[in-house]
Interface confidence: medium
């Protein structure tokens, strides 16, 4: 991998604690300033994979709210807006990191958690398993 | 809000700091063992919507590794394996917590950030934007 | 404003090669697609081909083996090729855009032409 | 390849009158998606065509609600309520549902 030197103006870490606790500023640098995935665009609805998006809330994590994809349908929208289930509809999941409070109901001290998320559905075409 | 009373054995925070510094436990608590989406499934593969993942490395941040989806084609994949342009593959996106490493090459010194990734791909109809 | 400005030979020998260049303006190559079509004197639409805003192409089979198209996105332009012309080739060949969102659409906006005579 | 027949492919008319042409495919337009990809051209003596109605029935912008399209399937439309001269030319219409694209031979709107 990269060697990078350190940086001389790191704060100090005790060697106990290193390198499995660190320091963290919560003052986050975010490039999006749309956070509301049903604002964000009606993908969810003109799917031909459509899902339904829940809130997901937990004030011991953060962040606290998730939203979570659940596809509509088993099978996948056609041309008249009924259900094919030649095709199915699927949930993209993703591996997202959040912090767990830890110790609970502590403001300042966290754990991180990695956690599998589903983001949306898509459309794919079913693998056949036959029976012997 | 719900108010939770704070755990007498928190670690102390001082006022300078505090919120916006906090203490990152980074043994992560990870109940998903497969984090290679390519081998988590096949559906990047299987799609209407097929999408290629590309690998996004950058030192300075947890985790250095991030997969993101391209969509493959304008259009989505129709009943004969051709590409229709009649629908869209559109990615999927979703905003995710990162560690951004503040000061730079500071191993145990991090700010939080957002950033958007694109996840996977779906199928979706189009809508005509027709500009006057 | 959206326009579409083309440029190209008028006359050109039987057997010969075509190059036709379409230079756009008030739109961008990599949200809109465009077509190609070209019109005999006197007579209907023939639809030609079409590159999509990411560089795929979709060809009127009848022509392919005839025709090639590309695009340069940061010279705001696109290229037709046409191959083995005859005298049938003489036409108005136009280049036109179609809507960026709604691939397959209609074609909104359409070039001026460029006049294409094959002949000896 | 679809074929596009067009009636008339002359249509004489006074000027106020109401026009109407029509198209019929040889295959049906509806895409598997729903939509159906007609649409109506209108190149005036001398110029490139310009696009008047998307997707069967809706106007292009500028174009006058004098025009109308109608129709689904194979058998389509185009009405002109009140003929002004500046509508004279050559009407097309031209499907997008089926590759290659295809155009109708056109309907020649003229003064009568």
């Known amino acids: 991998g990269i060697t990078i030197p350190r940086n001389p103006g790191c704060p100090n870490s005790e060697d106990k604690n290193f390198p499995r606790t660190v320091m963290v500023n919560l003052n986050i640098h975010n490039r999006n300033t749309n956070t509301n995935p049903k604002r964000s665009s009606d993908y969810y609805n003109r799917s031909t994979s459509p899902w339904n998006l829940h809130r997901n809330e937990d004030p011991e994590r953060y962040p606290s709210v998730i939203w979570e994809a659940k596809c509509r349908h088993l099978g996948c929208i056609n041309a008249d807006g009924n259900v094919d289930y030649h095709m199915n509809s699927v949930p993209i999941q993703q591996e997202i990191l959040v912090l767990r409070r830890e110790p609970p109901h502590c403001p300042n001290s966290f754990r991180l958690e990695k956690i599998l998320v589903s983001v949306g559905c898509t459309c794919v075409t079913p693998i056949v398993h036959h029976v012997a | 809000g719900i108010t939770i009373p704070r755990n007498p054995g928190c670690p102390n925070s001082e006022d300078k700091n505090f919120p916006r510094t906090v203490m990152v436990n980074l043994n992560i608590h990870n109940r998903n063992t497969n984090t290679n989406p390519k081998r988590s499934s096949d559906y990047y593969n299987r799609s209407t919507s097929p999408w290629n993942l590309h690998r996004n490395e950058d030192p300075e941040r947890y985790p250095s590794v991030i997969w993101e989806a391209k969509c493959r084609h304008l259009g989505c994949i129709n009943a004969d394996g051709n590409v229709d342009y009649h629908m869209n593959s559109v990615p999927i996106q979703q905003e995710i917590l990162v560690l951004r490493r503040e000061p730079p090459h500071c191993p145990n010194s991090f700010r939080l950030e957002k950033i958007l990734v694109s996840v996977g791909c779906t199928c979706v109809t189009p809508i005509v934007h027709h500009v006057a | 404003q959206v326009q579409l400005q083309q440029s190209g030979p008028d006359l050109v020998a039987p057997s010969q090669s075509l190059s036709i260049t379409c230079t756009v303006s008030g739109f961008s190559l990599t949200s809109n697609g465009v077509h190609w079509v070209r019109q005999p004197p006197g007579k209907g639409l023939e639809w030609l081909v079409v590159?999509?805003?990411?560089?795929?192409?979709t060809y009127n089979s009848a022509l392919k083996s005839r025709l090639s198209i590309s695009k340069d996105n940061s010279k705001s332009q696109v290229f037709l090729k046409m191959n083995s012309l005859q005298t049938d080739d003489t036409a108005m060949y136009y280049c036109?855009?179609?809507?960026?969102?709604?691939?397959?659409?209609?074609?909104?906006?359409w070039g001026q032409g460029t006049t294409l005579t094959v002949s000896s | 390849d679809i074929v596009m027949t067009q009636v008339p492919l002359s249509l004489p008319v006074s000027l106020g009158d109401q026009a109407s042409i029509s198209c019929r495919s040889s295959?049906?337009?509806?895409?598997?998606?729903?939509?159906?990809?007609l649409h109506w051209y209108l190149q005036k003596p001398g110029q490139s065509p310009k696009l008047l109605i998307y997707?069967?029935?809706n106007r292009f912008s500028g174009v006058p609600d004098r025009f109308r399209g109608s129709g689904s399937g194979t058998d389509f439309a185009l009405k002109i309520s009140r003929v002004e001269a500046e509508d004279l030319g050559v009407y097309f219409c031209?499907?997008?549902?089926?590759?290659?694209?295809?155009f109708g031979a056109g309907t020649k709107l003229e003064i009568k």
């Open positions: 036109a855009r179609h809507d960026g969102y709604s691939y397959y659409y209609a074609m909104e906006y």
């Open positions: 295959q049906s337009l509806v895409h598997s998606n729903g939509n159906t990809y």
């Open positions: 031209s499907q997008s549902t089926h590759v290659p694209l295809t």
């Open positions: 997707k069967v029935s």
């Open positions: 590159i999509w805003s990411d560089g795929s192409t």
